[in-house]
């Protein structure tokens, strides 16, 4: 038998520095977790102790903190090179700055293979990107070879900016011929490494003949065997075992997100490359693991530019940006409108001639808006200002919901109106009218939504049975502020871009902003 140790990360999302337990900014260093310096310590410790070790990343290194905003992926290449990753799969967020924003900082600089079997380049891009990412790579490990085949969410065109010259094929259809090719090269130990979410990971394990292990990402899935060491609740055991259609037991793993854990999977293969056994658990990278001094010094060197950036002007406002709780928790506020407009603007994807855009709606809990911005400071808006408005380091995500769920969400928005509670919703692409004289749960008297399948956008009544795409904070997608119905009833959830980054990009693009209160949210009494 031959033993392989797979160390894996996914959805690190720009958490190069250590973070607090909830993956936001580190405040009390003695209680902080993750970060590349701490990750390196643990990886090196395992490399020294065990003979056959692979360090893999399942995508979405890009996007999530000011590190990505400033360095645009150069930081990913630099520190992944320093940690000596063996391979990475492309995630959807790797395309956030377009194909050029992937090629220049990452593909050209990585000292390790970057993989995806189901992304096919066409037109002029085909030769430009040729060889910069691969469908698979064969890596020697000890005296054996291991094949690693990559995959990426086929929803990427709706979630990021890959452009029109990349085709995202069905994962299973694209993977099978590449795995078959590896088999003809006498590679009998094959890992599928990719970024399509836990459900697709399990399908790949079930359907793709010849895949021995699946290492996934995208869904931020936490798997654990035994008592979990932190706040994350396991979605299943680690590894999660799938019985393939041809009767094999295929381990599937993922390691939550944000570099908080290092996935640790030990696989035992027989001489024919069959998996005999698999066991392990994610390792919580808490403060009991010291940060590597040389990586930490490098992080501190790179940090300097970030501090300078946060005080530079992004754009100007010529109006007061009312982000006060007195406004945003009680009525339509122009800060809420600004943020929602930025959220929609960030999700403009013209992927179908029938639709002016794939999504038109935004909801945002008023309690998530933490500060106003005064225009009487020469109108200047900085990253620092925005960090006061959106201090939680969240993301603006894409979900699919039925109209009935949205109706419940808007009822919840005002079910205890008047107590300055955070669940009051700010909106974009939605016109809502509340009648507070009615009993809680029956206060939404009008709910119109902006059409997407139209050349001239207009507002139509919400249909209860229709499925709608909505942009909202990850906090709401996860049921925060009591929006349990969103968490329980959402049909799809794809994590998006860092909240501050979305708003800062919009302000930089617009240069001068003047958001108004314009009747998106109204109150009435009497009949309708």
């Amino acid at each position: 038998a031959w033993e392989l140790t797979i160390l894996h990360t996914n959805d690190v999302h720009s958490r190069l520095e250590q973070t607090s337990e909830d993956s936001s900014k580190c405040v009390n260093a003695s209680r902080c977790m993750g970060g590349v310096a701490r990750l390196f310590t643990k990886v090196q410790q395992i490399r020294r102790a065990e003979p056959n070790v692979l360090l893999l990343d399942a995508g979405d290194q890009y996007q999530g903190t000011i590190w990505f905003t400033v360095y645009k992926g150069a930081e990913v290449a630099h520190f992944m090179n320093a940690l000596r990753y063996d391979a990475m799969a492309l995630g959807n967020h790797e395309f956030d700055n377009g194909v050029e924003g992937l090629i220049e900082p990452l593909l050209k600089e990585a000292k390790f293979p970057i993989l995806s079997a189901n992304i096919k380049a066409k037109g002029p891009l085909a030769s430009q990107i040729s060889g910069l990412y691969l469908p698979y790579k064969v890596l020697p490990v000890g005296d054996e070879v291991v094949g690693i085949v990559g995959y990426t969410s086929k929803e990427t065109p709706f979630l990021s900016n890959p452009g029109t010259n990349l085709v995202f094929e069905d994962e299973i259809t694209a993977l099978q011929p590449e795995v078959d090719k590896l088999k003809t090269l006498n590679v009998n130990k094959i890992i599928a490494l990719g970024h399509s979410g836990f459900e697709m990971d399990k399908l790949i394990a079930q359907k793709v003949r010849g895949v021995d292990v699946v290492v996934g990402g995208h869904s931020n899935t936490f798997l654990y065997t035994g008592n979990p060491p932190s706040k994350e609740v396991p979605a299943g055991k680690y590894p999660f075992i799938v019985t393939s259609d041809d009767g094999r037991k295929v381990p599937v793993v993922q390691a939550y997100a944000f570099g908080k854990y290092l996935g640790y999977l030990k696989i035992e293969f027989d001489e024919r490359g069959n998996v005999i056994s698999s066991h392990g658990n994610p390792i919580l990278l808490n403060s009991s693991i010291p940060e590597d001094p040389s990586i930490k010094a490098d992080i501190n060197k790179w940090r300097i530019k970030l501090d300078n950036y946060s005080t530079q002007e992004l754009g100007k406002t010529i109006v007061y940006l009312d982000g006060s709780s007195q406004s945003c928790r009680f009525r339509e506020c122009n800060m809420g409108n600004l943020i929602c407009d930025a959220m929609i603007n960030n999700n403009l994807r013209h992927t179908d001639e029938m639709f002016w855009n794939h999504v038109s709606m935004c909801i945002l809990n008023g309690g998530g808006i933490r500060s106003p911005i005064d225009e009487r400071n020469n109108g200047t808006i900085t990253w620092e200002n925005l960090a006061a408005v959106l201090p939680f380091g969240g993301t603006f995500d894409l979900v699919q919901l039925k109209g009935s769920t949205l109706k419940k969400a808007f009822e919840h928005s005002v079910h205890r109106y008047g107590q300055s509670t955070g669940e009051f919703l700010q909106v974009g692409g939605i016109h809502v009218v509340y009648d507070l004289s009615r009993k809680p749960g029956d206060r939404v008297v009008k709910l119109d939504v902006l059409c997407t399948k139209c050349r001239v956008p207009s507002y139509d009544p919400l249909k209860m049975d229709e499925v709608y795409k909505v942009i909202l904070p990850n906090f709401l997608a996860n049921g925060g502020d009591g929006f349990q119905m969103i968490k329980d009833e959402l049909l799809r959830h794809d994590s998006g871009d860092q909240d501050i980054n979305v708003v800062s990009t919009y302000i930089s693009k617009m240069k001068v902003i003047y958001p108004a209160v314009e009747g998106r949210i109204k109150f009435s009494t009497g009949s309708h």
Epitope: A110, F112, G131
Partner: antibody, heavy 117, light 106 residues
Framework: QVQLVQSGAEVKKPGASVKVSCKAS????????MHWVRQAPGQGLEWIGE????????NYNEKFKSRATLTVDKSTSTAYMELSSLRSEDTAVYYC??????????WGQGTLVTVSS | DIQMTQSPSSLSASVGDRVTITCKAS??????LSWFQQKPGKSPKTLIY???IWVDGVPSRFSGSGSGQDYTFTISSLQPEDIATYYC????????FGQGTKVEIK
Amino acid sequence: QVQLVQSGAEVKKPGASVKVSCKASGYTFTSYWMHWVRQAPGQGLEWIGEINPSIGRTNYNEKFKSRATLTVDKSTSTAYMELSSLRSEDTAVYYCARRVYGTMDYWGQGTLVTVSS
Amino acid sequence: DIQMTQSPSSLSASVGDRVTITCKASQDINSYLSWFQQKPGKSPKTLIYRANIWVDGVPSRFSGSGSGQDYTFTISSLQPEDIATYYCLQYDELYTFGQGTKVEIK
């Protein structure tokens, strides 16, 4: 297929400059960095520097920083290495090589530069 | 600057012999090490990168291993066409070649 075709041999006087070219074909020139390496007669390989053709960014061996200049012409997919203030010890074969995964993969055929009075 | 010490500077072996060349870096180079073969009057040819990964089409008799500061290049069964000079290169911090090892057949 990937090819790097270099310019012909040069004979130069001490104190002069030489400009060696490397024309790339079979791939998109701007998608990969280009290295320059030299080899004096009977000696080992010595790295001079590298250039990112899409943005013109360069990294140099400290030894050559003041005398070597790396440039590109994107329209013709050609990389250039100019070495100034030549001395007899600069007599060498100069190679261009494409960078992949941080190292070299494809190499040019080499250009012999002879510095002699 | 990282220094690379390659040894031996030359060796003579018989066809079929196992040949080993070593490279020692002046500091940990994180396995960012390549091996090249250069035949007389020819350009170098890349054989191995990342200490142990073969370039496509390179015969399996060539292999690399090592980590940290110490690396080894092995020809498991020397062939007449393997007569050449072999170089290591570190690419962890910029680039430094080893001095080369000339391999001859007895």
